[in-house]
Amino acid sequence: SITGISPITESLASLSTYNDQSITFALEDESYEIYVEDLKKDKKKDKVLLSYYESQHPSSESGDGVDGKMLMVTLSPTKDFWLQANNKEHSVELHKCEKPLPDQAFFVLHNRSFNCVSFECKTDPGVFIGVKDNHLALIKVDYSENLGSENILFKLSE
Protein backbone atom coordinates (compact mmCIF):
# COMPACT_ATOMS: atom_id res chain seq x y z
CA SER A 1 0.00 0.00 0.00
CA ILE A 2 1.15 3.54 -0.66
CA THR A 3 1.72 5.33 2.64
CA GLY A 4 -0.70 8.24 2.83
CA ILE A 5 -2.13 9.94 -0.20
CA SER A 6 0.34 12.79 -0.45
CA PRO A 7 3.84 12.49 -1.88
CA ILE A 8 6.82 12.65 0.46
CA THR A 9 8.49 15.09 -1.94
CA GLU A 10 8.15 16.47 -5.46
CA SER A 11 10.62 17.82 -7.97
CA LEU A 12 10.64 19.29 -11.45
CA ALA A 13 13.22 17.66 -13.67
CA SER A 14 14.00 17.02 -17.29
CA LEU A 15 14.15 13.40 -18.32
CA SER A 16 16.78 12.09 -20.68
CA THR A 17 18.07 8.72 -21.76
CA TYR A 18 21.41 7.15 -20.88
CA ASN A 19 22.59 8.36 -24.30
CA ASP A 20 21.49 11.94 -23.52
CA GLN A 21 18.47 12.03 -25.76
CA SER A 22 15.63 14.12 -24.37
CA ILE A 23 12.14 12.90 -23.56
CA THR A 24 9.74 15.46 -24.99
CA PHE A 25 5.98 15.85 -25.01
CA ALA A 26 3.91 17.36 -27.81
CA LEU A 27 0.20 18.11 -28.04
CA GLU A 28 -1.15 16.62 -31.26
CA ASP A 29 -4.85 16.36 -32.14
CA GLU A 30 -5.91 16.98 -28.54
CA SER A 31 -3.70 14.24 -27.15
CA TYR A 32 -0.09 14.19 -26.05
CA GLU A 33 2.64 12.28 -27.83
CA ILE A 34 5.91 11.26 -26.20
CA TYR A 35 9.15 11.48 -28.17
CA VAL A 36 12.76 10.49 -27.58
CA GLU A 37 14.97 12.82 -29.58
CA ASP A 38 18.18 14.76 -29.84
CA LEU A 39 17.44 18.35 -28.91
CA LYS A 40 18.87 21.31 -30.74
CA LYS A 41 21.27 23.20 -28.48
CA ASP A 42 19.07 26.24 -27.99
CA LYS A 43 15.87 24.28 -27.33
CA LYS A 44 14.70 24.13 -23.73
CA LYS A 45 14.20 20.68 -22.25
CA ASP A 46 10.69 19.70 -21.22
CA LYS A 47 10.25 19.39 -17.47
CA VAL A 48 8.32 16.67 -15.69
CA LEU A 49 6.81 16.88 -12.22
CA LEU A 50 8.00 13.83 -10.31
CA SER A 51 5.96 13.02 -7.23
CA TYR A 52 7.61 10.54 -4.88
CA TYR A 53 5.54 8.23 -2.72
CA GLU A 54 6.60 5.78 -0.07
CA SER A 55 5.09 2.34 -0.43
CA GLN A 56 4.96 -0.15 2.41
CA HIS A 57 5.73 -3.68 1.28
CA PRO A 58 4.55 -6.18 3.91
CA SER A 59 6.74 -9.18 4.71
CA SER A 60 3.97 -11.51 3.55
CA GLU A 61 4.53 -10.16 0.01
CA SER A 62 8.27 -9.55 0.12
CA GLY A 63 9.23 -13.21 0.36
CA ASP A 64 12.15 -12.56 2.70
CA GLY A 65 10.23 -12.06 5.94
CA VAL A 66 11.10 -8.36 6.11
CA ASP A 67 8.74 -5.40 5.97
CA GLY A 68 10.24 -3.13 3.35
CA LYS A 69 9.63 0.27 1.82
CA MET A 70 9.81 1.20 -1.81
CA LEU A 71 10.01 4.58 -3.46
CA MET A 72 7.38 5.06 -6.15
CA VAL A 73 6.99 7.93 -8.58
CA THR A 74 4.36 9.43 -10.78
CA LEU A 75 5.43 11.57 -13.74
CA SER A 76 3.39 14.51 -14.96
CA PRO A 77 4.70 16.64 -17.84
CA THR A 78 1.69 18.96 -17.82
CA LYS A 79 -1.21 19.71 -15.52
CA ASP A 80 -3.68 16.82 -15.09
CA PHE A 81 -1.72 14.48 -17.41
CA TRP A 82 0.33 11.54 -16.15
CA LEU A 83 2.52 8.89 -17.74
CA GLN A 84 0.79 5.54 -17.54
CA ALA A 85 1.73 1.99 -18.34
CA ASN A 86 -0.44 0.22 -20.88
CA ASN A 87 0.58 -3.34 -20.19
CA LYS A 88 -1.59 -4.84 -22.93
CA GLU A 89 0.02 -2.72 -25.65
CA HIS A 90 3.46 -2.65 -23.96
CA SER A 91 3.29 1.10 -24.34
CA VAL A 92 3.75 4.22 -22.24
CA GLU A 93 0.99 6.78 -22.69
CA LEU A 94 -0.04 10.16 -21.37
CA HIS A 95 -3.52 10.23 -19.92
CA LYS A 96 -5.62 12.91 -18.34
CA CYS A 97 -6.82 11.68 -14.99
CA GLU A 98 -8.01 12.75 -11.59
CA LYS A 99 -6.67 11.78 -8.21
CA PRO A 100 -6.51 9.20 -6.80
CA LEU A 101 -4.34 8.11 -9.69
CA PRO A 102 -4.67 4.57 -11.05
CA ASP A 103 -1.97 2.01 -10.25
CA GLN A 104 -0.80 2.22 -13.87
CA ALA A 105 0.55 5.72 -13.13
CA PHE A 106 2.90 4.50 -10.39
CA PHE A 107 6.44 3.29 -11.04
CA VAL A 108 8.90 1.78 -8.59
CA LEU A 109 12.10 3.79 -8.65
CA HIS A 110 15.41 1.96 -9.04
CA ASN A 111 18.82 3.57 -8.66
CA ARG A 112 21.32 2.42 -11.26
CA SER A 113 24.94 2.99 -12.22
CA PHE A 114 26.09 6.31 -13.70
CA ASN A 115 23.56 8.20 -11.54
CA CYS A 116 20.73 6.86 -13.67
CA VAL A 117 17.34 5.61 -12.56
CA SER A 118 14.85 3.08 -13.91
CA PHE A 119 11.08 3.02 -13.62
CA GLU A 120 9.41 -0.35 -12.95
CA CYS A 121 5.66 -0.75 -13.45
CA LYS A 122 3.83 -1.10 -10.17
CA THR A 123 1.22 -3.18 -11.97
CA ASP A 124 3.70 -5.48 -13.71
CA PRO A 125 6.92 -6.25 -11.77
CA GLY A 126 9.90 -6.89 -14.03
CA VAL A 127 8.54 -4.53 -16.69
CA PHE A 128 10.27 -1.16 -17.05
CA ILE A 129 9.85 2.05 -19.01
CA GLY A 130 12.40 1.87 -21.79
CA VAL A 131 13.33 3.29 -25.16
CA LYS A 132 12.35 1.48 -28.33
CA ASP A 133 12.44 3.00 -31.82
CA ASN A 134 12.65 6.58 -30.53
CA HIS A 135 9.59 6.11 -28.34
CA LEU A 136 8.96 5.08 -24.78
CA ALA A 137 7.76 1.52 -24.41
CA LEU A 138 7.37 -1.10 -21.72
CA ILE A 139 10.26 -3.53 -21.70
CA LYS A 140 10.35 -6.84 -19.85
CA VAL A 141 13.67 -7.24 -18.07
CA ASP A 142 15.25 -10.47 -16.90
CA TYR A 143 16.57 -9.56 -13.44
CA SER A 144 19.51 -11.90 -13.66
CA GLU A 145 20.74 -10.60 -17.00
CA ASN A 146 19.74 -7.14 -18.05
CA LEU A 147 19.28 -4.79 -15.13
CA GLY A 148 22.07 -2.67 -16.51
CA SER A 149 20.45 -2.48 -19.97
CA GLU A 150 21.02 1.00 -21.30
CA ASN A 151 17.56 1.27 -22.83
CA ILE A 152 15.90 1.33 -19.40
CA LEU A 153 18.32 3.86 -17.88
CA PHE A 154 17.24 7.48 -17.50
CA LYS A 155 18.84 10.64 -16.15
CA LEU A 156 16.98 13.22 -14.10
CA SER A 157 18.30 16.78 -14.16
CA GLU A 158 16.70 19.62 -12.26
Epitope: I8, T9, S62, K69, H110, S113, N115
Partner: antibody
Framework: QVHLKESGPGLVAPSQSLSITCNVS????????VHWIRQTPGRGLDWLGV???????SYNSALMSRLSISEDISKSQVFLKMNDLQTDDSAIYFC???????????????WGQGTLVTVSA | DIQMTQSPASQSASLGESVTITCLAS??????LAWYRQQPGKSPQLLIY???RLADGVPSRFSGSGSGTKFSFKINNLQAEDFVIYYC?????????FGGGTRLEM
Protein backbone atom coordinates in the same frame (compact mmCIF):
# COMPACT_ATOMS: atom_id res chain seq x y z
CA GLN B 1 16.07 -9.15 12.20
CA VAL B 2 18.36 -7.24 9.79
CA HIS B 3 22.03 -7.84 10.48
CA LEU B 4 25.28 -6.93 8.69
CA LYS B 5 28.73 -7.93 9.88
CA GLU B 6 32.11 -7.11 8.38
CA SER B 7 35.14 -9.35 8.71
CA GLY B 8 38.57 -8.16 7.66
CA PRO B 9 42.27 -8.89 8.21
CA GLY B 10 42.93 -6.15 10.75
CA LEU B 11 46.50 -5.48 9.64
CA VAL B 12 47.64 -4.98 6.04
CA ALA B 13 51.16 -4.22 4.82
CA PRO B 14 51.67 -1.17 2.57
CA SER B 15 51.17 -1.86 -1.18
CA GLN B 16 49.25 -5.05 -0.36
CA SER B 17 45.53 -5.60 -1.01
CA LEU B 18 42.61 -5.61 1.39
CA SER B 19 39.69 -8.03 1.31
CA ILE B 20 36.64 -7.54 3.55
CA THR B 21 33.49 -9.65 3.63
CA CYS B 22 30.07 -8.32 4.66
CA ASN B 23 27.81 -11.13 5.87
CA VAL B 24 24.15 -10.13 5.79
CA SER B 25 20.99 -11.71 7.15
CA UNK B 26 17.33 -10.77 7.52
CA UNK B 27 17.01 -9.30 4.02
CA UNK B 28 17.59 -10.17 0.40
CA UNK B 29 20.48 -8.84 -1.69
CA UNK B 30 18.16 -9.03 -4.70
CA UNK B 31 16.05 -6.24 -3.17
CA UNK B 32 18.47 -4.00 -1.27
CA UNK B 33 21.70 -2.28 -2.20
CA VAL B 34 24.72 -2.71 0.09
CA HIS B 35 27.21 0.14 0.44
CA TRP B 36 30.79 0.32 1.66
CA ILE B 37 31.86 3.31 3.75
CA ARG B 38 35.06 4.01 5.63
CA GLN B 39 35.78 6.34 8.53
CA THR B 40 38.98 8.01 9.68
CA PRO B 41 39.45 10.63 12.40
CA GLY B 42 40.95 13.01 9.84
CA ARG B 43 38.63 12.57 6.85
CA GLY B 44 35.36 11.60 8.51
CA LEU B 45 32.99 9.34 6.57
CA ASP B 46 33.85 8.42 2.97
CA TRP B 47 31.49 6.56 0.68
CA LEU B 48 33.41 3.93 -1.32
CA GLY B 49 30.81 2.22 -3.48
CA VAL B 50 27.61 0.22 -3.70
CA UNK B 51 26.46 -3.12 -4.99
CA UNK B 52 22.87 -2.46 -6.03
CA UNK B 53 19.94 -4.84 -6.07
CA UNK B 54 20.22 -6.57 -9.43
CA UNK B 55 24.00 -6.58 -9.34
CA UNK B 56 25.03 -3.25 -10.86
CA UNK B 57 27.91 -1.53 -9.08
CA SER B 58 28.85 2.12 -8.57
CA TYR B 59 32.21 3.25 -7.22
CA ASN B 60 33.62 6.46 -5.83
CA SER B 61 35.57 7.68 -8.85
CA ALA B 62 38.46 8.86 -6.63
CA LEU B 63 39.14 5.24 -5.65
CA MET B 64 37.69 3.39 -8.62
CA SER B 65 41.01 2.15 -9.98
CA ARG B 66 41.78 0.38 -6.69
CA LEU B 67 38.32 -0.88 -5.73
CA SER B 68 36.33 -3.97 -6.58
CA ILE B 69 32.93 -4.90 -5.13
CA SER B 70 31.26 -8.27 -5.70
CA GLU B 71 28.71 -10.60 -4.12
CA ASP B 72 27.77 -14.19 -3.51
CA ILE B 73 23.99 -14.08 -3.30
CA SER B 74 23.72 -17.75 -2.34
CA LYS B 75 25.82 -17.07 0.77
CA SER B 76 24.36 -13.60 1.44
CA GLN B 77 27.82 -12.06 1.24
CA VAL B 78 29.16 -8.85 -0.27
CA PHE B 79 32.89 -8.38 -0.81
CA LEU B 80 35.14 -5.35 -0.92
CA LYS B 81 38.61 -5.63 -2.41
CA MET B 82 41.03 -2.72 -2.41
CA ASN B 83 44.48 -2.78 -3.98
CA ASP B 84 47.75 -1.01 -3.25
CA LEU B 85 46.93 0.10 0.28
CA GLN B 86 48.80 3.02 1.84
CA THR B 87 48.91 4.21 5.43
CA ASP B 88 46.15 6.75 4.82
CA ASP B 89 43.80 3.86 3.94
CA SER B 90 43.85 2.92 7.63
CA ALA B 91 40.22 3.27 8.72
CA ILE B 92 37.14 1.58 10.07
CA TYR B 93 35.36 -0.03 7.11
CA PHE B 94 31.57 -0.38 7.27
CA CYS B 95 28.98 -2.06 5.10
CA UNK B 96 25.45 -0.66 5.19
CA UNK B 97 22.06 -1.48 3.67
CA UNK B 98 19.72 0.88 1.80
CA UNK B 99 16.56 2.07 3.52
CA UNK B 100 14.45 1.51 0.39
CA UNK B 101 14.14 -1.50 -1.86
CA UNK B 102 16.06 -0.83 -5.09
CA UNK B 103 16.91 2.78 -4.22
CA UNK B 104 19.53 4.70 -2.25
CA UNK B 105 17.56 7.95 -2.03
CA UNK B 106 16.43 7.10 1.52
CA UNK B 107 19.88 6.71 3.05
CA UNK B 108 21.37 3.73 4.85
CA UNK B 109 19.02 2.19 7.40
CA UNK B 110 21.23 -0.58 8.78
CA TRP B 111 24.98 -0.65 9.31
CA GLY B 112 27.49 -3.29 10.29
CA GLN B 113 29.61 -2.79 13.39
CA GLY B 114 32.64 -1.94 11.25
CA THR B 115 36.05 -3.57 10.98
CA LEU B 116 39.25 -1.72 11.81
CA VAL B 117 41.95 -1.92 9.14
CA THR B 118 45.45 -0.70 9.92
CA VAL B 119 48.00 -0.31 7.13
CA SER B 120 51.46 -0.69 8.57
CA ALA B 121 54.73 -2.46 7.91
CA ASP C 1 31.29 15.67 -6.53
CA ILE C 2 28.75 17.38 -4.30
CA GLN C 3 30.31 18.97 -1.22
CA MET C 4 28.36 18.94 2.04
CA THR C 5 29.21 21.71 4.49
CA GLN C 6 27.93 21.03 7.97
CA SER C 7 27.85 23.63 10.73
CA PRO C 8 28.69 24.14 13.48
CA ALA C 9 31.56 21.66 13.88
CA SER C 10 30.77 21.51 17.58
CA GLN C 11 28.07 22.92 19.82
CA SER C 12 27.50 23.06 23.55
CA ALA C 13 24.04 22.72 25.03
CA SER C 14 22.29 21.62 28.22
CA LEU C 15 19.80 18.90 28.98
CA GLY C 16 16.27 19.86 27.94
CA GLU C 17 17.41 22.54 25.49
CA SER C 18 16.99 22.56 21.70
CA VAL C 19 19.75 22.64 19.09
CA THR C 20 19.81 23.11 15.33
CA ILE C 21 22.46 21.87 12.91
CA THR C 22 22.74 23.09 9.30
CA CYS C 23 23.95 21.34 6.17
CA LEU C 24 24.62 23.12 2.87
CA ALA C 25 25.00 21.25 -0.43
CA SER C 26 27.24 22.66 -3.16
CA UNK C 27 24.50 21.96 -5.72
CA UNK C 28 20.82 21.13 -5.55
CA UNK C 29 20.00 17.69 -4.17
CA UNK C 30 16.21 17.92 -4.02
CA UNK C 31 15.06 16.27 -0.79
CA UNK C 32 17.66 13.51 -0.88
CA LEU C 33 19.37 14.19 2.42
CA ALA C 34 19.81 11.93 5.46
CA TRP C 35 20.89 12.67 9.02
CA TYR C 36 22.74 10.16 11.22
CA ARG C 37 24.03 10.08 14.75
CA GLN C 38 27.06 8.14 15.87
CA GLN C 39 27.80 7.13 19.43
CA PRO C 40 31.43 6.48 20.43
CA GLY C 41 32.65 3.13 19.15
CA LYS C 42 29.39 2.45 17.29
CA SER C 43 28.26 2.65 13.68
CA PRO C 44 26.11 5.55 12.43
CA GLN C 45 22.35 5.32 12.98
CA LEU C 46 19.83 6.72 10.50
CA LEU C 47 17.60 9.36 12.12
CA ILE C 48 16.07 11.32 9.22
CA TYR C 49 15.77 10.44 5.53
CA UNK C 50 14.34 12.32 2.54
CA UNK C 51 15.15 15.54 4.46
CA UNK C 52 12.10 15.37 6.74
CA ARG C 53 11.09 11.74 7.31
CA LEU C 54 11.70 10.17 10.68
CA ALA C 55 13.36 6.73 10.50
CA ASP C 56 11.70 3.81 12.28
CA GLY C 57 11.97 3.94 16.07
CA VAL C 58 13.41 7.48 16.18
CA PRO C 59 11.77 9.78 18.77
CA SER C 60 9.71 12.71 17.50
CA ARG C 61 11.97 15.24 19.24
CA PHE C 62 14.23 14.83 16.19
CA SER C 63 13.16 16.68 13.04
CA GLY C 64 14.54 17.71 9.66
CA SER C 65 13.67 20.41 7.17
CA GLY C 66 14.86 21.97 3.93
CA SER C 67 15.24 21.12 0.25
CA GLY C 68 17.48 22.05 -2.64
CA THR C 69 20.76 23.16 -1.08
CA LYS C 70 19.96 24.18 2.52
CA PHE C 71 18.91 21.73 5.22
CA SER C 72 18.40 21.86 8.96
CA PHE C 73 18.23 19.27 11.70
CA LYS C 74 16.70 20.01 15.09
CA ILE C 75 16.69 18.17 18.41
CA ASN C 76 14.20 19.30 21.04
CA ASN C 77 14.40 18.47 24.74
CA LEU C 78 17.98 17.19 24.68
CA GLN C 79 18.60 13.92 26.52
CA ALA C 80 21.90 12.60 27.88
CA GLU C 81 22.26 10.11 24.98
CA ASP C 82 22.01 12.94 22.42
CA PHE C 83 25.48 14.33 23.18
CA VAL C 84 27.25 12.53 20.34
CA ILE C 85 28.29 13.26 16.74
CA TYR C 86 25.76 14.00 13.95
CA TYR C 87 26.34 13.72 10.19
CA CYS C 88 24.37 14.74 7.12
CA UNK C 89 24.66 12.86 3.81
CA UNK C 90 23.44 13.65 0.31
CA UNK C 91 21.94 10.79 -1.71
CA UNK C 92 21.09 12.65 -4.88
CA UNK C 93 24.10 11.39 -6.83
CA UNK C 94 27.21 9.29 -6.39
CA UNK C 95 29.56 9.61 -4.63
CA UNK C 96 27.13 9.88 -1.72
CA UNK C 97 29.04 12.48 0.29
CA PHE C 98 28.82 13.18 4.02
CA GLY C 99 29.14 16.39 5.96
CA GLY C 100 32.11 16.80 8.29
CA GLY C 101 30.05 16.12 11.40
CA THR C 102 28.79 18.11 14.38
CA ARG C 103 29.88 17.16 17.89
CA LEU C 104 27.23 17.97 20.47
CA GLU C 105 28.73 18.61 23.89
CA MET C 106 27.11 19.03 27.28
Amino acid sequence: QVHLKESGPGLVAPSQSLSITCNVSGFSLSKYGVHWIRQTPGRGLDWLGVLRAGGTISYNSALMSRLSISEDISKSQVFLKMNDLQTDDSAIYFCARDHYYYSSFGGFASWGQGTLVTVSA
Amino acid sequence: DIQMTQSPASQSASLGESVTITCLASQTIGAWLAWYRQQPGKSPQLLIYAATRLADGVPSRFSGSGSGTKFSFKINNLQAEDFVIYYCQQLNSTPYTFGGGTRLEM
